[in-house]
Interface confidence: medium
């Protein structure tokens, strides 16, 4: 089955960069968003710090670390109130991600 232009393969995501001219000259605003084409039973999430289609049960039960959201070599730690997770780098630096 061939994909039309701009069509994503099932179960994949891509990062879309939105460029927008500011009212002020020489200032350009850039923001990124993800576009996903997830299969049934999947939902957009994060794997290895990149957008990915993940098992919807992970989101439902807030088992965020089961998405493998951190980079290789980092440790994932679920926030106790299940509002997100932390990724701990080998050097000890901690990055916290919360889900709204």
């Amino acid at each position: 089955q061939f994909l039309k232009e701009g069509q994503l393969a099932a179960g994949t995501c891509e990062i879309v960069t939105l460029d927008r001219d500011s009212s002020q000259p020489r200032i350009e605003e850039r923001s990124q968003t993800a576009r996903c084409a997830c299969r049934k039973g999947q939902i957009a999430g994060t794997t290895r710090a990149r957008p990915a289609c993940v098992d919807a049960r992970i989101i439902k039960t807030k088992q965020w670390c089961d998405m493998l959201p951190c980079l290789e070599g980092e440790g994932c730690d679920l926030l106790i109130n299940r509002s997100g997770w932390t990724c701990t780098q080998p050097g000890g630096r901690i990055k916290t991600t919360t889900v709204s």
Partner: antibody, heavy 122, light 110 residues
Framework: AVTLDESGGGLQTPGGALSLVCKAS????????MGWVRQAPGKGLEWVGV????????SYGSAVKGRATISRDNGQSTVRLQLNNLRAEDTGTYFC???????????????WGHGTEVIVSS | ALTQPSSVSANPGETVKITCSGG??????YGWYQQKSPSSAPLTVI????KRPSDIPSRFSGSKSGSTHTLTITGVQAEDEAVYFC??????????????FGAGTTLTVL
């Protein structure tokens, strides 16, 4: 084999403070969230609180909230429960518990310590 | 917050089912913990709905039907006589997610 060894229990006075320590072995301690569960004499199990892997996040049951502090030392493979302003209702056996996955809940405990008995009495 | 029968009894070799319902986080599953005497430590027989620790006999199993979780002991033995607690999580705005346990079911092997 996974072992959790609690210490620090004994007779305590009302209004005082206690410090319980759980020494873990047989698994990679820093990879698991840990918790404390207690049991009053002749009663059921009661959730005390939990701590995440790095020690940066904790949560406590309503009966001890504001009086309890859980901390951990991943280098020493220990988790500590400090309980202040002790009451007679704090009497019971305190168990250290290990989570089975990347988190600990009352559904995911896969190992328990033998327990340490605490008696709060004047 | 978790409801389980106060007692069940069975003859050796029979199948025993202990139910547990309620709790605030059914998505997070249920655990089952065996305590043989009030002074002994609990032993995990089932965690995360149906996972069994490697040292627990295969006669112990866990299952879910709707909002009720069931611990099944197929071919109960005398040494299975104990109190069984189910565990789950509940959510409150002041404490967040906090573990809850049932009051315990006393299994008597006749």
């Amino acid at each position: 084999a996974v072992t959790l060894d609690e210490s620090g229990g004994g007779l305590q006075t009302p209004g005082g403070a206690l410090s319980l320590v759980c020494k873990a072995s047989g698994f990679t301690f820093s990879s698991y969230q840990m918790g404390w569960v207690r049991q009053a004499p002749g009663k059921g199990l009661e959730w005390v609180g939990v701590i995440n892997k790095s020690g940066s996040d904790t949560s406590y049951g309503s009966a001890v909230k504001g009086r309890a502090t859980i901390s951990r030392d991943n280098g020493q493979s220990t988790v500590r429960l400090q309980l202040n302003n002790l009451r007679a209702e704090d009497t019971g056996t305190y168990f250290c518990a290990k989570g089975s996955a990347s988190y600990i809940t009352a559904a995911t405990i896969d190992a328990w310590g033998h327990g340490t008995e605490v008696i709060v009495s004047s | 917050a978790l409801t389980q029968p106060s007692s069940v009894s069975a003859n050796p070799g029979e199948t025993v089912k202990i139910t547990c319902s309620g709790g605030g986080s059914s998505g997070y599953g249920y655990g089952w913990y065996q305590q043989k005497s009030p002074s002994s430590a609990p032993l995990t027989v089932i965690y995360w709905n149906d996972k069994r620790p490697s040292d627990i006999p295969s006669r112990f199993s866990g299952s879910k039907s709707g909002s009720t979780h069931t611990l099944t002991i197929t071919g109960v033995q005398a040494e299975d006589e104990a109190v069984y607690f189910c565990g789950n999580d509940d959510y409150s705005s002041d404490s967040g997610y906090v573990g809850v346990f049932g009051a315990g079911t006393t299994l008597t092997v006749l």
